[in-house]
Amino acid sequence: EEELQVIQPDKSVSVAAGESAILHCTVTSLIPVGPIQWFRGAGPARELIYNQKEGHFPRVTTVSESTKRENMDFSISISNITPADAGTYYCVKFRKGSPDTEFKSGAGTELSVRAKPSAPVVSGPAARATPQHTVSFTCESHGFSPRDITLKWFKNGNELSDFQTNVDPVGESVSYSIHSTAKVVLTREDVHSQVICEVAHVTLQGDPLRGTANLSETIRVPPTLEVTQQPVRAENQVNVTCQVRKFYPQRLQLTWLENGNVSRTETASTVTENKDGTYNWMSWLLVNVSAHRDDVKLTCQVEHDGQPAVSKSHDLKVSAHPKEQGSNTAAENTGSNERNIYIVVGVVCTLLVALLMAALYLVRIRQKKAQGSTSSTRLHEPEKNAREITQDTNDITYADLNLPKGKKPAPQAAEPNNHTEYASIQTSPQPASEDTLTYADLDMVHLNRTPKQPAPKPEPSFSEYASVQVPRK
């Protein structure tokens, strides 16, 4: 009779975690008499999995009725398989004795455990980054087996190629982890963008797992600033607007500075969201020009998302010399000389005298005709201003001409000394009525821009005012 053989027909078996594994084993003979034992591994530290004769093995059951006398099938089922159960299992026949001795072993069955990867977790950089910068995203998934796994990166549905992936451990293990780092270049349009990590594994049956990260948590779009000045209908008032455009996130602090000092003037503001997810902020400041003796440097200072403040300055001039309105510089050298000032003053004065004469002439003609049209001329001397005599270098001579023409920005000039002349030509919308008023105003008023002090010596100052009303057909 041929000697007993132990047959383990399956060289390998793969089972999903949580399922049961069936390990097949048959013997070719009933002789010699003796029990079957199952071991995981071989060598000195092999682990007993099942002993037909004795012991308690709650997760192991025999597939056939092993207690039957003629039974030659010693296959076992191991329930609730975990990755820790992976290894090579041996079915070993023992010869009955005192003690029982090993007689024959099967060739072994390698059990591998298929375990699903955990949901990928995508994490971005700790600090926000600005457009054009490259940021790194990491994706991690754990606990899968076998080792073979596929990981892909996407940005808004477009596959990324700049990434590096590692599966750990490098060698054999009961379960594995994957770690991937992708590099993403940020653009200004990425506020609504998403980065997706996709993991495919044999256990997922073609339905990959995805982890996402919103670039809104990573990107910082710095604002662009623009400060503009618009005239308002109210006399001697200017509306200065600071437009903070295309920024993200919304966390923003805006401060107005007047000549470097924080403005206490109340400002109105509005926030709007753009289609790309960025925000716009508009803040405006109503400035009373007559309340200032000198040029006013208005600065719109913005602190965005805890970053160093950025600012845009605007020089509010009381001058006839034209100068660009917006400026990023901290201080500006005017560079004009006194000769230019006198020329400008002369031209303005000549213009004003000519206008006055024309107005008076028109009034006289109207009076002679006396055809229902009325005209009036008023000359008055205003009350005396209390003022320090020594402070005459701070004088501001102010002339305002309001004519019904197209919009024109007020030309401004910065002066090298504290004596400033200001010429402004402003227009307001034409009244609905056919009768339009043409209004000429000559006003010479001494203003003081220095901090208010008690004035021991009042100094006379005068104002001339002419008003002409003309019906216009």
Epitope: A42, G43, P44, P169, G171
Partner: antibody, heavy 123, light 106 residues
Framework: QIQLVQSGPELKKPGETVKISCRAS????????MSWVKQAPGKGLRWMGW????????TCADDFKGRFAFSLETSATTAYLQIHNLTNEDTATYFC????????????????WGQGTLVTVSA | IVMTQSQKFMSTTIRDRVSITCKAS??????VAWYQQKSGQSPKLLIY???NRYTGVPDRFTGSGSGTDFTLTISNMQSEDLADYFC?????????FGSGTKLAIK
Amino acid sequence: QIQLVQSGPELKKPGETVKISCRASGYTFTTYGMSWVKQAPGKGLRWMGWINTYSGVSTCADDFKGRFAFSLETSATTAYLQIHNLTNEDTATYFCARDPHSYGNSPAWFPYWGQGTLVTVSA
Amino acid sequence: IVMTQSQKFMSTTIRDRVSITCKASQNVGISVAWYQQKSGQSPKLLIYSASNRYTGVPDRFTGSGSGTDFTLTISNMQSEDLADYFCQQYSSYPLTFGSGTKLAIK
């Protein structure tokens, strides 16, 4: 295919140190334990000990404790045997040999062997 | 555990049947492997678990025994089988090899 490639022969003086490498390929390095076996000229095989490539823990046979050390460079899938303070009795061919069992917690038999590294210790 | 291969040399002829024996100093069950080593080469696994032929090993090689006495049999000796043969136990630490048996042609 599975291969274990060892470093070349070494000629050393007594008292010196030698480090032999065994580079594995064709399988997952950290799945299988690696043993070292010594064979003196014209003599039999002696198991020196093994290293668990997954944990990095090594076990030396009693006869080889002290001057012998096993190490790994997992990223290079390489195992090392280092012998300190060489003597003439260390002249031998040293083999690395791979265990058959994945996730094995002890070596058994050896289906894969390196080609051997001859270390000659001579004054 | 000492593994004793009492025959250091064995003379044989081609197509002969050769049996190489190995004795363990204590019970090792069936935790025995057999290797073949040709001159200048590394050992090659033939048998594990006392009687299981390793993948790719010709079926003229068979292993038997359990406990303390083990035998490797070459049923149809071939010239390429001329080599040293070693037994090894892996029942307990340290793993130990027999001293070897050299097969030579008569």
